[in-house]
C-alpha cells in the first residue's frame, strides 16, 4: 500500500518499515507493539484500549451512561450504574 515513507524528512523504504516498524514505538500507555507482517497491532495493558492503547478505560470523562445512569471508575475499567429499569454496558 505504501511504497516509500518520509520519516522525519528521511526516506524509509517499505522493507525498512517492515523490519523496523515496532521500533517506531506507536503504542501508548505501555502497550506492546506486535508486527503481524502485513499490519501492526498494539496489545494494551489492562485499562487501556484503542489502535495505540490511547483510550483510558478507567476514565469516565470518555464515556457517558444513557438514561440517567452514572459512570463508576475503578479496577482498570469503568462501568455504568444504571437507573431503575435500564441495564447493559451503557444503560440502554
Amino acid at each position: 500500500d505504501h511504497h516509500h515513507h518520509h520519516h522525519e524528512q528521511k526516506l524509509i523504504s517499505e522493507e525498512d518499515l517492515r523490519v523496523d516498524r515496532c521500533s517506531l514505538q506507536p503504542c501508548r500507555n505501555g502497550g506492546l507493539c506486535l508486527d503481524l507482517g502485513h499490519a501492526l497491532r498494539c496489545r494494551c495493558r489492562a485499562g487501556f484500549a484503542g489502535p495505540r492503547c490511547e483510550h483510558d478505560l478507567d476514565d469516565c470523562a470518555g464515556r457517558a451512561c444513557a438514561n440517567g445512569g452514572t459512570c463508576v471508575e475503578g479496577g482498570g475499567a469503568h462501568r455504568c450504574s444504571c437507573a431503575l429499569g435500564f441495564g447493559g454496558r451503557d444503560c440502554r
Partner: antibody, heavy 118, light 113 residues
Framework: QVQLVQSGAEVKKPGASVKVSCKAS????????MHWVRQAPGQGLEWMGW????????NYEQKFQGRVTMTRDTSISTAYMELNRLRSDDTAVYYC???????????WGQGTLVTVSS | DIVMAQSPDSLAVSLGERATINCKSS????????????LVWYQQKPGQPPKLLIY???TRESGVPDRFSGSGSGTDFTLTISSLQAEDVAVYYC?????????FGQGTKLEIK
Amino acid sequence: QVQLVQSGAEVKKPGASVKVSCKASGYTFTDYYMHWVRQAPGQGLEWMGWINPNSGGTNYEQKFQGRVTMTRDTSISTAYMELNRLRSDDTAVYYCTRDAVVIPMDYWGQGTLVTVSS
Amino acid sequence: DIVMAQSPDSLAVSLGERATINCKSSQSVLDTSNNKNYLVWYQQKPGQPPKLLIYWASTRESGVPDRFSGSGSGTDFTLTISSLQAEDVAVYYCQHYYNSPYTFGQGTKLEIK
C-alpha cells in the same frame, strides 16, 4: 489495493434511523481499526468513534453515546454505523476510515450523504 | 477533551509563495515515553474525503510532495507549503490522536491570491 466502499446516499425523516455500510477490500479487515467521521455541509470534520473489527469493541464520542452503534460483519469485511433518533443537524457526509496504527486514518471511504428532512 | 484551534481560518497566498497554517492544542499531544507528537494534517478538496499529508507532526505520508512539511511539538504545530501550487487550493485540518476523543481543528481554507 486498499478500498473502502460505502453505501449510497440516504434521505431520512427526523426521529428515524440510518445504517451506513463500509465494505473493505485489499487488506485483512480484522487487522485494522475502523473510524467513523462526519462532515456537515460546509463544516469541519467530526470524529464519531471507532470499532475494533477483530473483537467488535467500540469507543464512541460522548455526544453520540446512546444514539450511535458501530458493528461489523467479518465474513463480508464490512463495518456499519447506525445512528438513531435523527435530527436535522445530523445531515452530513459520513466517512469510514482505516487506522494503520503508525499511520492513522490512512484510507477513507468515498463518503455517504445522509439528509435528514421532514 | 483536547481542543484544536487553527489559524488563520482562511489564507490567500500567491503561486510560488510560502503558505503557513498553525494549529494549537489545548494540552500537549507529545508522549514523552517515545517522543512522538500524536498530530496529523489532512488536505481536503471539494467533494472528496480528506487526504493524509503528515503524521507524527512531521512525517510526510507516502506520495506527498516535499513542498509540504510539518513542524512543532507539544501544543504548537505548523503546516508549511514552501511553494504554493494551484492544486494545493483546499481546506487543511489538523487532528490529534493522543487520546480519545480524537478532535479536529476547525479547518483553514487556502486560496490563491
